[in-house]
Amino acid sequence: TLNSVLNSNAIKNLPPPLGGAAGHPGSAVSAAPGILYPGGNKYQTIDNYQPYPCAEDEECGTDEYCASPTRGGDAGVQICLACRKRRKRCMRHAMCCPGNYCKNGICVSSDQNHFRGEIEETITESFGNDHSTLDGYSRRTTLSSKMYHTKGQEGSVCLRSSDCASGLCCARHFWSKICKPVLKEGQVCTKHRRKGSHGLEIFQRCYCGEGLSCRIQKDHHQASNSSRLHTCQRHHHHHHHHHH
C-alpha cells in the first residue's frame, strides 16, 4: 500500500522539521499527483511505489514491523509490513500495533498493564547499541559480498544499525542509508504517533542515545500538536504521558 511505502522509516529517524537538513522546507515532490510529502524535495520522483526494504523493525513506521513478505520466504528479503491487530498471531512485540504487545504468540492489549507504554521508549527509542529484539528473533544478513572488516564510520553506507560503529545508527539520507550519530541530550527528535504522520522521510535522524527518550520539550507543551518540539531527554522513573 502507499502507506506502507511512505511510513517505512525508523520511529526516531526523521526528516528535520527544525534544525536539520536546511534547504528542504516542504518542497513539492513530483510523485503521485496531488500528494505533498513532508521533507520531500523537488528533485525526487517516485516512478512506482515499492515495498520499503528493511533489516530491523526500527526502520519501519510505528504501525509496521520488518519481516519477509511470504511465509517461509527468503529471510534475506524483508520489507515493512502492516502491524498486527489485537488477537492476531505474532512472534515478537514489534509485530503488534501500538497499544498491544505479543503474549504467548497473540497480540494482546497493553492498556491494562502499561507494558508496551513503559518499555516502548527503552526499547525503540533508547536501545543505544543493543539492537536485539525481545523474542530473540534472528535475521539473516544481506550484506554485500565485500565483507566489511570494520564498523562503518559517519558517512559510511549501511543496511542496518549494527553495521555502524558505536554511537552511530543506520539512517536514510536521500538514496542511501548511512551511519549517522545517535542523538545526544537536548537534540531535536520527532516521535511519530499516528500512521501517515511522517510522510516520505528522505532525511532520517538517529534515535536518542542510551538513557534518553524522545519527549516533548517542556516549554513547547502549549504549542499546537503539529508543531510540538521533541528533544532527547533523560529518563524519569515515572512515565504517565503515554498516549495510545
Partner: antibody, heavy 117, light 111 residues
Amino acid sequence: EVQLVESGGGLVQPGGSLRLSCAASGFTFSSYAISWVRQAPGKGLEWVASVSGWLDTYYPDSVKGRFTISRDNAKNSLYLQMNSLRAEDTAVYYCATSLENYAFDYWGQGTTVTVSS
Amino acid sequence: EIVLTQSPATLSLSPGERATLSCRASESVDDFGISFINWYQQKPGQAPRLLIYAGSKQGSGIPARFSGSGSGTDFTLTISSLEPEDFAVYYCQQLKEVPPTFGGGTKVEIK
C-alpha cells in the same frame, strides 16, 4: 571484486533516443543505490540520475522529463533511457554506486554518447 | 542548488611538495553531525576515484598522504608529499542536498 560495466553509447541525432546499460557484479546489487554521472568533453563532472535500493528515483532539472533511470535487480543491471537528446548531452556517461561510503565510491569505465547531426 | 568553488584552478608543484586544494560551498554542507563533502581524483581517460568522503574520512585503499579537513563551507584536500602518480584533476562534491554538485576541479600539474 566490484565491477560496473557500461554499454549502449554511440552517435545519435538531436531529438533521438538512446538506452545505456550498466552491468554490476561483486556486490548485492539490490541493496544499494546506483547513479549515472556524466562528463562532457574537457569539462567537469555532472550528476545525471540516481535510484535507491527501494527504487525511488532522483534527477536534476537538466534531464528531468527526458531521462529515466531504472534498475533490474534480477539481472544486476542499471539503465538510463535518454530521450529528446540534445547536443549538450554529449558526454562520457559513468555508472557509479554508493557501496561503502555516502559518495560515488565505485565507478564504471564509462560509455561515450555523442549527440550530433 | 549548492555551488562549489574550487581553487586554484591549476596548481603547479614538484614531486615531494605539499599540495593544498580548496573547496568552498555556497552554503553549509554540514548536517546530522556529518560534513557531506567528498573528494575525487581523475586522471586522463579514466573514471574518477574516491579519495575522501564525509569531509575527512579516507576511501578504501587510499594512501595516507591524502587527507581532508574543514567544516561548514570551507574544505581542504591536502596531499602531504606529491608522488608522480598524484598529478591529476581533483574534484570536490557535496551530497548534502539533491542535486549533488561538483566543483569545477583543480588540476595539479608538474612544475
